[in-house]
């Protein structure tokens, strides 16, 4: 399956914080999504290939990494100035 | 086991076509994507591009833009290095390399050795 | 484009004798995720390149524990704690941390 951690997280004023996403499905794909109150998903970030990935339309204030294809951690970086969302990780084949 | 087979030595004359081929195995193919790497003789390692193996889209080092191409053929697990109009100073060693887990080039070809000469 | 430059060039020893090589980058290379893509690849005479060392520190799976990589930021250093006979050749610092990804010149270990 896919597993996407922590449940919940709370982030202090200037702190990065990252947010693990692991498959063992053997999808060579792997998106990261946020979804507002109210509002549809939109795409942060997506990785199709190891050490390789892609801004989707809401890059602004996170950063990636896709060193194994197994995981696509998402770090929210300080410089999110609204980070209070629903973020949902997924893949694909 | 993870290997990566190269075509074999060329020789070609100033503004001939050359392309070399890296088959892989071992591995799934579009799970990792391809360096290729040049060395003059004699000379050092020079990173000519990469090639995202699931999308087919390339990246180019500067000097490598306009006369290089890297493709792929999926069905065959095989990445290629077409140079164009060759000319002397491409003699050289390509060597395909995949970029593994962690960022590195944790498999290498055995190297192609290309001659340009009149 | 990140400048690598290695020292030194040629780095003459005793086998059993440790090896210190030095790679300094132009510019940071600590990506936006925080990590350090530099690498270090061993080319024994004839062979093709082999991955000794990524992400600054780590050991590739198969490279004894005489290698060891350390640094941040802009400078870097592989050692060779006892030099053995299929240790010789050249020694090159790659950063993939940033497009072009660009090797060091080269540090050719040989014996004294």
């Known amino acids: 399956g896919i597993t996407q951690s922590p449940k919940y997280l709370f982030r202090k004023e200037g702190q990065n914080v990252t947010l693990s996403c692991e498959q063992n499905l053997n999808h060579d794909a792997m998106y990261w999504y946020r979804q507002d109150p109210g509002q549809g998903l939109r795409l942060i970030y997506y990785s199709q290939i190891v050490n390789d990935f892609q801004k989707g339309d809401i890059a602004e204030g996170y950063s990636v990494s896709r060193e194994k294809k197994e995981s696509f951690p998402l770090t929210v970086t300080s410089a999110q100035k609204n980070p209070t969302a629903f973020y949902l990780c997924a893949s694909s084949i | 086991e993870v290997q990566l087979q190269e075509s074999g030595p060329d020789l070609k004359k100033p503004g001939e076509t050359v392309k070399i081929s890296c088959k892989a195995s071992g591995y799934t193919f579009t799970t990792y994507g391809m360096n290729w790497v040049k060395q003059a003789p004699g000379k050092g390692l020079k990173w000519m591009g990469y090639?995202?193996?699931?999308?087919?889209?390339?990246t180019y080092a500067d000097d490598f833009k306009g006369r290089f191409a890297f493709s792929l053929e999926t069905s065959a697990n095989t990445a290629y290095l077409q140079i164009n109009n060759l000319r002397n100073d491409d003699t050289a060693t390509y060597f395909c390399?995949?970029?593994?887990?962690?960022?590195?080039?944790?498999?290498w070809g055995q190297g192609t050795s290309v001659t340009v000469s009149s | 484009d990140i400048v690598m430059t290695q020292s030194p060039l040629s780095l003459p020893v005793s086998l059993g004798d440790q090896a210190s090589i030095s790679c300094r980058s132009s510019q940071s290379i600590v990506r936006s995720n925080g990590f350090t893509y530099l690498e270090w690849y061993l080319q024994k005479p004839g062979q093709s390149p082999e991955l000794l060392i990524y992400k600054v520190s780590n050991r590739f799976s198969g490279v004894p524990d005489r290698f060891s990589g350390s640094g941040s930021g802009t400078d870097f250093t592989l050692k060779i704690s006892r030099v053995e006979a299929e240790d010789l050749g050249v020694y090159y610092c790659?950063?993939?941390?940033?497009?072009?990804?660009?090797f060091g010149g080269g540090t050719k270990l040989e014996i004294k």
């Open positions: 090639l995202n193996t699931y999308s087919g889209v390339s």
């Open positions: 390399a995949r970029w593994g887990n962690y960022g590195a080039m944790d498999y």
């Open positions: 790659f950063q993939s941390s940033h497009v072009p990804r660009t």
